[in-house]
């Protein structure tokens, strides 16, 4: 008789979860040689041991303790782009500007990027059927304080200037309950950090408003005013040719605006 | 019935090379993480490769590391090591084995086949 | 890496005793143990993992325990089939290690 299992709102853990982790893993310490020390089965051992035979509603970040340990990295702290509700762009603005990194750049956020997973309270399983939903189950479940922990980590490491990108297509350019907003903004240290930029990536070729004035952006800046970080902010109104320019600094068409 | 069956041991020269091969049967094959352990003469026993279900993944002991290969071929229910370099001391009974669990790598091995013997000798 | 220890090579018993057979690790190992029996002529087969969950077939004479560093494989009642070579194992980190191993003669 097949034993009753908890039903949550949320997908699944995402199919052949341990050997995408161990072949991410893999790879990543393959092409950094700054990580080649990492062995990828210890790694793979402390996320297990992180969220299985846990009640996938009540993980804790200490749970990820052992990994974060593990994953410890250095990137250069005046390097760093966050973003919010635009991670293709982001991720393919670092990949051409390789000095400069995302969240996803970094060993941990490159293993769980885009998976989910989720284990079942005092059994050793995997729940392949379905995973808590952030707002429909309960916040404290394995993916979001994994990117709760990182992000936390990843914006305590940041100093100088921080680059930030924005979805200006959103309705709330800057949303107070992102990960961004709920977790990165308030870790920004203010000793280490001097500025942080928004970038504001227009979605519409025609739209040529200022969403540097929206609201939310406001609203952003007199948080991290108050942080005593300064804030500037910049629209990008083509970001197909923003892209292009930084593949190509010197074609003649990027010295006017973008 | 779930089976294991390895095939391919056998006497080889030190510095020379054998291919061990695991027919398996009676389960999904791919579902699960395979191994290949050995026994000693003296009875001890060292796990020395590991795969994942989908076959992207290695991992090996340090004691067989770039001498070692593990593949499968999953459409075939297979899997194989590819053993180069041979030393006496990897002298052998070489067991294929399953790992305790189809979700992830336990570790713990539920199913061994009866195993194949390697002599490293000149 | 983890030294699984069984202190005893042999071990003597008569059928119908109970007998304990021991396993420590050099550090905590969080009940990730399995224990398996080799019969003469025959490869390994898993009895216990979890430290003390049995596997599926295995009868109900054989009961794992322990926690932290100390393991035990406990046979209420031998039968006269259970004189094999019996190991523990970690699967807890890498890399998984065995123990030496303990033969259980019948007296």
């Known amino acids: 008789v097949p034993r009753w299992r908890q039903q949550w709102s949320g997908p699944g853990t995402t199919k052949r979860f341990p050997e995408t982790v161990l072949a991410r893993c893999v790879k990543y310490t393959e092409i950094h040689p700054e990580m080649r020390h990492v062995d990828c089965q210890s790694v793979w051992d402390a996320f297990k041991g992180a969220f299985i035979s846990k009640h996938p509603c009540n993980i804790t970040e200490e749970d990820y303790q052992p990994l974060m340990k593990l994953g410890t990295q250095t990137v250069p702290c005046n390097k760093i782009l966050l973003w919010s509700r635009i991670k293709d762009l982001a991720h393919q603005f670092t990949q051409v500007q390789r000095d400069m990194f995302t969240l996803e750049d970094t060993l941990l956020g490159y293993l769980a990027d885009d998976l989910t997973w989720c284990g079942e309270f005092n059994t050793s399983k995997i729940n392949y059927q379905s995973c808590p939903d952030w707002r429909k189950d309960c916040s404290n479940n394995p993916v979001s304080v994994f990117w709760k922990t990182v992000s936390r980590r990843f914006a305590e490491a940041a100093c100088d200037v921080v680059h930030v990108m924005l979805n200006g297509s959103r309705s709330k350019i800057f949303d107070k309950n992102s990960t961004f907003g709920s977790v990165e903004v308030h870790n920004l240290q203010p000793e280490k950090v001097q500025t942080l930029e928004a970038w504001v990536i227009h979605g519409g070729r025609e739209d040529s408003r200022d969403l540097c004035q929206d609201p939310t952006i406001k609203e952003l800046e007199s948080i991290i005013s108050k942080r005593n970080i300064q804030f500037s902010c910049k629209n990008i109104y083509r970001p197909d040719k923003f892209l292009q320019c930084v593949k190509n600094p010197e074609d003649s068409s990027c010295t006017s605006e973008i | 019935e779930v089976q294991l069956v390895e095939s391919g041991g056998g006497l080889v020269k030190p510095g020379g090379s054998l291919k061990l091969s695991c027919a398996a049967s009676g389960f999904t094959f791919s579902d699960y993480f395979m191994y290949w352990v050995r026994q000693t003469p003296e009875k001890r026993l060292e796990w020395v490769a590991i795969i994942s279900d989908g076959g992207i993944y290695t991992y090996y002991p340090d004691s067989v590391k770039g001498r070692f290969t593990i593949s499968r071929d999953n459409a075939k229910n297979n899997l194989y090591l590819q053993m180069s370099s041979l030393k006496s001391e990897d002298t052998a009974m070489y067991y294929c084995a399953r790992d305790g669990r189809d979700d992830y790598d336990g570790w713990y091995f539920d199913v061994w086949g009866a195993g194949t013997t390697v002599t490293v000798s000149s | 890496d983890i030294v699984m220890t069984q202190s005893h090579k042999f071990m003597s018993t008569s059928v119908g005793d109970r007998v304990n057979i021991t396993c420590k690790a050099s550090q905590d190992v969080n009940t990730a143990v399995a224990w398996y029996q080799q019969k003469p002529g025959q490869s390994p087969k898993l009895l216990i993992y979890?430290?003390?969950t049995r596997h599926a077939g295995v009868p109900d004479r054989f009961t794992g325990s322990g926690s932290g560093t100390d393991y035990a494989l406990t046979i209420s009642s031998v039968q006269a089939e259970d004189l094999a070579l019996y190991y523990c194992?970690?699967?807890?980190?890498?890399?998984?290690?065995f123990g030496g191993g303990t033969k259980l003669e019948i007296k």
């Open positions: 979890w430290a003390s």
């Open positions: 194992q970690q699967h807890y980190s890498t890399p998984r290690t």
